[in-house]
């Protein structure tokens, strides 16, 4: 058993049918010595008396808010949460496996640049009685500071019969140098509590591996005289690290017909312009990627050919 | 510790080309190592990220773009630094700053070259003959060093009398390649910045 926060405790259980569970001793936070009784949640049934209460915690029915009273007055509370260990592996019931980039990916994180700011998000099908708390650091043995905000509900989607909820959090490394070569990964830890179930999820990454630039901005077409060709031009996104000559991007320009089946023409360039043939009803899209370290491509910025 | 905007140096262009070749070569070699050594801990998540140049060179600081010198986090990230007196920056000649940066890159290359050659000699003794260093990568390191055109005393290749532990050598190869790829990215950024300056 360990303390998650004041008066909230997590009981770690080896979770299998007929498991013996864990013996827990609760102590009433009071100078009083006698006349103390204990109850669980809203029930008035007295579970025991005395300054300490010994319970055998086996299932969720044994978890909840234990309260000690004296003469009708509440003295203190202890909330017991359960953390299930199923065959040596902590349970992951609360969050959905996003399966990207690999199986067992519960937290996904992205950064728009090298400033040390990043966003993480996760998915769940649970809509109520759910709380998250997020901590982060650079490295784990001698951790350096990363400050995270509060997790917020950022999107709701309908997937088949289920509703899916996306939560996200923004974090910022306290003293980040965009040019630094990372040798210790960022660690992100999310505590999730659903009703009386506690789970924790972690992710470990280098900022350089989670970079995903914003799409190029100011995408424009300039027709070339007496030609079906157009000059496409664009600019670095505002959120990208500067100077751009040091933090350079490379670009992919795509001409896509109306039908998805039509052949796509693609051009790769380090410049912020390209000459392409604009077909009728086609659209031109441009996306960006770090020129020197191949992390994710940005989303496409698009303009119609017409 | 910083690189003010400089007048273009005609000698930078070949360096930019060579640094791009270097990044390509080390990335290919790392990919090959990860595929060949699939039963070894060779992914970025599994290895310890060690930097053999730590406390010996100071490339990130010496080659810092002028725009980032205002960022305090960039100025105190290493113990070793070529220029410790921040107030002197304005009075220092751009060419001197550039020389410090490029000589630091040269020293990096030299250290990695020695490590890779020593390692290759061990890998050639492996009866499994599982993996060797790409000669193209070693050649590209050499070419960039020549293009940088610094003279410094040759570091003798480390020779080892004891029987090599091939498992450890292959894991060390992965560690070295990951670190060298990160340094190659920095070198490419620097050359691109100098080229644009």
């Amino acid at each position: 058993i360990w303390e998650l926060k004041k008066d909230v405790y997590v009981v770690e259980l080896d979770w299998y049918p007929d498991a013996p569970g864990e013996m827990v001793v609760l102590t009433c936070d009071t100078p009083e010595e006698d006349g103390i009784t204990w109850t669980l949640d809203q029930s008035s049934e007295v579970l025991g008396s005395g300054k300490t209460l010994t319970i055998q915690v086996k299932e969720f029915g044994d978890a909840g808010q234990y309260t000690c009273h004296k003469g009708g007055e509440v003295l203190s509370h202890s909330l017991l949460l359960l953390h299930k260990k199923e065959d040596g592996i902590w349970s992951t019931d609360i969050l959905k496996d996003q399966k990207e980039p690999k199986n067992k990916t519960f937290l996904r994180c992205e950064a728009k640049n090298y400033s040390g700011r990043f966003t993480c998000w996760w998915l769940t099908t649970i809509s109520t009685d759910l709380t998250f708390s997020v901590k982060s650091s650079r490295g784990s043995s001698d951790p350096q500071g990363v400050t995270c905000g509060a997790a917020t509900l950022s999107a709701e989607r309908v997937r088949g019969d289920n509703k899916e909820y996306e939560y996200s959090v923004e974090c910022q490394e306290d003293s980040a140098c965009p040019a630094a070569e990372e040798s210790l990964p960022i660690e992100v830890m999310v505590d999730a509590v659903h009703k009386l179930k506690y789970e924790n999820y972690t992710s470990s990454f280098f900022i350089r591996d989670i970079i995903k630039p914003d799409p190029p901005k100011n995408l424009q077409l300039k027709p070339l005289k007496n030609s079906r060709q157009v000059e496409v031009s664009w600019e670095y996104p505002d959120t990208w690290s500067t100077p751009h000559s040091y933090f350079s991007l490379t670009f992919c320009v795509q001409v896509q017909g109306k039908s998805k089946r039509e052949k796509k023409d693609r051009v790769f360039t380090d410049k912020t312009s390209a000459t392409v043939i604009c077909r009728k009803n086609a659209s031109i899209s441009v996306r960006a990627q770090d020129r020197y370290y191949s992390s994710s491509w940005s989303e496409w910025a698009s303009v119609p050919c017409s | 510790r910083n690189l003010p905007v400089a007048t273009p140096d005609p000698g930078m262009f070949p360096c930019l080309h060579h640094s791009q070749n270097l990044l390509r070569a080390v990335s290919n070699m790392l990919q090959k190592a990860r595929q060949t050594l699939e039963f070894y801990p060779c992914t970025s998540e599994e290895i310890d990220h060690e930097d053999i140049t730590k406390d010996k060179t100071s490339t990130v600081e010496a080659c810092l773009p002028l725009e980032l010198t205002k960022n305090e986090s960039c100025l105190n990230s290493r113990e070793t630094s070529f220029i410790t007196n921040g107030s002197c920056l304005a009075s220092r000649k751009t060419s001197f700053m550039m020389a410090l940066c490029l000589s630091s890159i040269y020293e990096d290359l030299k250290m990695y070259q020695v490590e890779f050659k020593t390692m290759n000699a061990k890998l050639l003794m492996d009866p499994k003959r599982q993996i060797f260093l790409d000669q193209n990568m070693l050649a590209v390191i050499d070419e960039l060093m020549q293009a940088l055109n610094f003279n410094s005393e040759t570091v003798p290749q480390k020779s080892s009398l004891e029987e090599p532990d091939f498992y450890k050598t292959k894991i060390k190869l992965c560690i070295l390649l990951h670190a060298f790829r990160i340094r190659a990215v920095t070198i490419d950024r620097v050359m691109s910045y100098l080229n644009a300056s």
């Epitope: 080896d14 299998y16 049918p17 007929d18 260990k85 199923e86 065959d87 040596g88 067992k104 | 801990p41």
Partner: antibody
């Protein structure tokens, strides 16, 4: 004490369907994940499928994906394995088992796929 | 498609020490715990070892398990006639959990 009693096995022709049941007692069935495991005659153990305690997630071996469906009825304390498009290579003793460090197995039920 | 490899058979005389190996990889045994099962002919498997080296109550202490790196082993010290059975190791793969990974199985023969 924990008990898992299986039923539903038998002889079936290739391409046909069969549903296996596993009735649980002696524990809070709705709190635990459950597996199906099979063993072809004279062969080793092969995992078939898993279902979470609340039925929200199901996982299958590649060899049965798209043909077998694992399900549970927590109100009836019963686990099911619906097997469709059966093949000769599905011939085996099928076991249900609880998920956890200490596990309990059903007695097994024989499924024979033969024309 | 077994990823955990065991020797097909091992044998020993009563009283001898018999060991069975179970060889895996970094993503399974290297990252997860190992269980061992005993299966007597015509019966369901019986759990002998869980969590690499823990014995459930009722399992004789002559059975012991250990794990090192990407391999695990089961030792029977002072093998007895009633130990003649098939033995299976089991673990998980970190990418496919909760799918069970079973070993190829080992037939233990008690001679004499």
């Amino acid at each position: 004490q924990v008990q898992l009693v299986q039923s539903g096995g038998g002889v079936v022709q290739p391409g046909r369907s069969l549903r296996l049941s596993c009735a649980a007692s002696g524990f809070t069935f709705s709190s635990y994940g459950m597996h199906w495991v099979r063993q072809a005659p004279g062969k080793g153990l092969e995992w078939v499928a898993f279902i979470r305690y609340d039925g929200s997630n199901k996982y299958y071996a590649d060899s049965v994906k798209g043909r077998f469906t694992i399900s549970r009825d927590n109100s009836k304390n019963t686990l099911y394995l619906q097997m469709k498009s059966l093949r000769a290579e599905d011939t085996a003793v099928y076991y249900c088992k609880t998920h956890g460090s200490h596990d309990n197995w059903g007695q097994g039920t024989m499924v024979t796929v033969s024309s | 498609s077994y990823v955990l490899t065991q020797p097909p058979s091992v044998s020993g005389t009563p009283g001898q020490r018999v060991t069975i190996s179970c060889s895996g990889g970094r993503s399974n045994i290297g990252s997860n715990t190992v269980k061992w099962y005993q299966q007597l002919p015509g019966t369901a498997p019986k759990l002998l070892i869980y969590g690499n080296d823990s014995r459930p109550s009722g399992v004789p202490d002559r059975f012991s398990g250990s794990k090192s790196g990407t391999s695990a082993s089961l030792a029977i010290t002072g093998v007895q006639a009633e130990d003649e059975a098939d033995y299976y190791c089991q673990s998980y793969d970190r990418g496919t959990h909760p799918a069970l990974l079973f070993g190829t199985g080992t037939k233990v023969t008690v001679l004499g």
